[in-house]
C-alpha cells in the first residue's frame, strides 16, 4: 500500500498514516501507530467534546453564573455543553446567553404584543384606537375601551390610548 494523502471520514492524517479520530466525549491521548490504534480517553466531570476530534484537552462546560442572572436550562454531558437560560423576569443579552437583563415593561399607551422569554425581550405595540393601557407592564396587553352602549350608558369622556372611556347615564330629557 502507498502512503495515504487523504483519509476517510472520522480519520486524520499524521506521519503519512490515517488514524481514527476520537469519538465525541473523548480526547486524544496518543496518535495511532501502525501497530496500535489511536488512544482516546473520556472527558472528565464538567468537560465535553461534541465532535469527532483529535483534541488533547476537553472543553469546560459553560458556567451559568447566578450573579449574572443565569441558571442551568440543560446540564452538560461529556458530549454536550451546558445550556444556560435566565432567571424569571430576565432574558439573555445574546445568543450565547452569557448574561441577562430585566425584561422591558411596556409604558402606558403601549401593550404587550409578545411576552418575554428566557432568550427574548418583551415586544410592545402602541394601543390602537379603541384600546388602551394605563399601566407600565411586562405582561398586560392593550385592553379594549369599555362599551358604554352594552351597559345602556353613554360616553361621557372619550377614551385615549392611555385611558378608558368614561360612561355615564343617558340624558333622560328628550326634545
Amino acid at each position: 500500500p502507498e502512503p495515504p494523502t487523504a483519509c476517510r471520514e472520522k480519520q486524520y492524517l499524521i506521519n503519512s498514516q490515517c488514524c481514527s479520530l476520537c469519538q465525541p466525549g473523548q480526547k486524544l491521548v496518543s496518535d495511532c501507530t501502525e501497530f496500535t490504534e489511536t488512544e482516546c480517553l473520556p472527558c472528565g466531570e464538567s468537560e465535553f467534546l461534541d465532535t469527532w476530534n483529535r483534541e488533547t484537552h476537553c472543553h469546560q462546560h459553560k458556567y451559568c453564573d447566578p450573579n449574572l442572572g443565569l441558571r442551568v436550562q440543560q446540564k452538560g454531558t461529556s458530549e454536550t455543553d451546558t445550556i444556560c437560560t435566565c432567571e424569571e423576569g430576565w432574558h439573555c443579552t445574546s445568543e450565547a446567553c452569557e448574561s441577562c437583563v430585566l425584561h422591558r415593561s411596556c409604558s402606558p399607551g403601549f401593550g404587550v404584543k409578545q411576552i418575554a422569554t428566557g432568550v427574548s425581550d418583551t415586544i410592545c405595540e402602541p394601543c390602537p384606537v379603541g384600546f388602551f393601557s394605563n399601566v407600565s407592564s411586562a405582561f398586560e396587553k392593550c385592553h379594549p375601551w369599555t362599551s358604554c352602549e352594552t351597559k345602556d350608558l353613554v360616553v361621557q369622556q372619550a377614551g385615549t390610548n392611555k385611558t378608558d372611556v368614561v360612561c355615564g347615564p343617558q340624558d333622560r330629557l328628550r326634545a
Epitope: P1, E2, P3, N15, S16, Q17, S30, T33, E34, F35, T36, E37, E39
Partner: antibody
Framework: EVQLLESGGGLVQPGGSLRLSCAAS????????MSWVRQAPGKGLEWVSG????????YYADSVKGRFTISRDNSKNTLYLQMNSLRAEDTAVYYC??????????WGQGTLVTVSS | DIQMTQSPSSLSASVGDRVTITCRAS??????LNWYQQKPGKAPKLLIY???SLQSGVPSRFSGSGSGTDFTLTISSLQPEDFATYYC?????????FGQGTKLEIK
C-alpha cells in the same frame, strides 16, 4: 507468494549480543510495517518490537527497551533485531511478522535464541 | 500495559462441537482485537481482525464478537484441523499485548 525467513538465532551467554535477520520476499517490503514477536518454550506470544513503513518509527515492549534495536534495510528487503545485554528470560523462538491493518497477516517460521551459560 | 485474560486456559471438545473462547481486556479497547491460531511447531495464523472481521482464506465457521473489554471467538462446528492454541491480541494501547492462550484439545 509472501515469505519471511528468520536467521541469526543460536546459543549465547547472558550479557552477550545477537543479531537476528528476517529476509522478506513476495511483496513490496518497504510499504509494510514489520514486527518481532517471541515465544518462550511452552509459553505464550509476546510482542517485542515494531518498525513502521514510511515514517520508520520504532516501538518496543518495556521488557526489551534500551537493550534491543529494530531496524530495516528496504534495499535488501530485510528486517533486523539487534539484541544486546541478553538475559535468560530472552530465551525464545523469535518470529518476524508483517503488519497490515493492525494485524500480523504473515509470519516467518521462527528462529530459536537460547541465552544460557 | 493492557492485560489480556483468556478463558478457559484449556478446553476439550469433539469434532462437530460448537466452541466459545473468551478474552477479557483490563481496560476498554473498543473493537481493537485480533485472534490467532497456532499449531505446535508452527507460526501463528491470523483468523479474526478488528474483533469480528474474518481474515481472507479463513473458514466461515470461525467468528468473533465483542467490544470494550469482553470478546469471544466462536467455532461453530469443530473440524479436526481446528485443534490448536488460540490467542487474542489487543492493539488499542501501546504496546500490543496477547492473551495467555487457550489450548483446544480433542476429547
Amino acid at each position: 507468494e509472501v515469505q519471511l525467513l528468520e536467521s541469526g538465532g543460536g546459543l549465547v551467554q547472558p550479557g552477550g549480543s545477537l543479531r537476528l535477520s528476517c529476509a522478506a520476499s513476495g511483496f513490496t517490503f518497504s510499504s509494510y510495517a514489520m514486527s518481532w514477536v517471541r515465544q518462550a518454550p511452552g509459553k505464550g506470544l509476546e510482542w517485542v518490537s515494531g518498525i513502521g513503513s514510511y515514517g520508520g518509527g520504532t516501538y518496543y515492549a518495556d521488557s526489551v527497551k534500551g537493550r534491543f534495536t529494530i531496524s530495516r534495510d528496504n534495499s535488501k528487503n530485510t528486517l533486523y533485531l539487534q539484541m544486546n545485554s541478553l538475559r535468560a528470560e530472552d530465551t525464545a523462538v523469535y518470529y518476524c511478522a508483517r503488519y497490515v491493518n493492525f494485524g500480523m497477516d504473515y509470519w516467518g517460521q521462527g528462529t530459536l535464541v537460547t541465552v544460557s551459560s | 500495559d493492557i492485560q489480556m485474560t483468556q478463558s478457559p486456559s484449556s478446553l476439550s471438545a469433539s469434532v462437530g462441537d460448537r466452541v466459545t473462547i473468551t478474552c477479557r481486556a483490563s481496560q476498554s479497547i473498543s473493537s481493537y482485537l485480533n485472534w490467532y491460531q497456532q499449531k505446535p511447531g508452527k507460526a501463528p495464523k491470523l483468523l479474526i481482525y478488528a474483533a469480528s472481521s474474518l481474515q481472507s482464506g479463513v473458514p466461515s465457521r470461525f467468528s468473533g464478537s465483542g467490544s470494550g473489554t469482553d470478546f469471544t471467538l466462536t467455532i461453530s462446528s469443530l473440524q479436526p484441523e481446528d485443534f490448536a492454541t488460540y490467542y487474542c491480541q489487543q492493539y488499542g494501547r501501546n504496546p500490543p499485548t496477547f492473551g495467555q492462550g487457550t489450548k483446544l484439545e480433542i476429547k
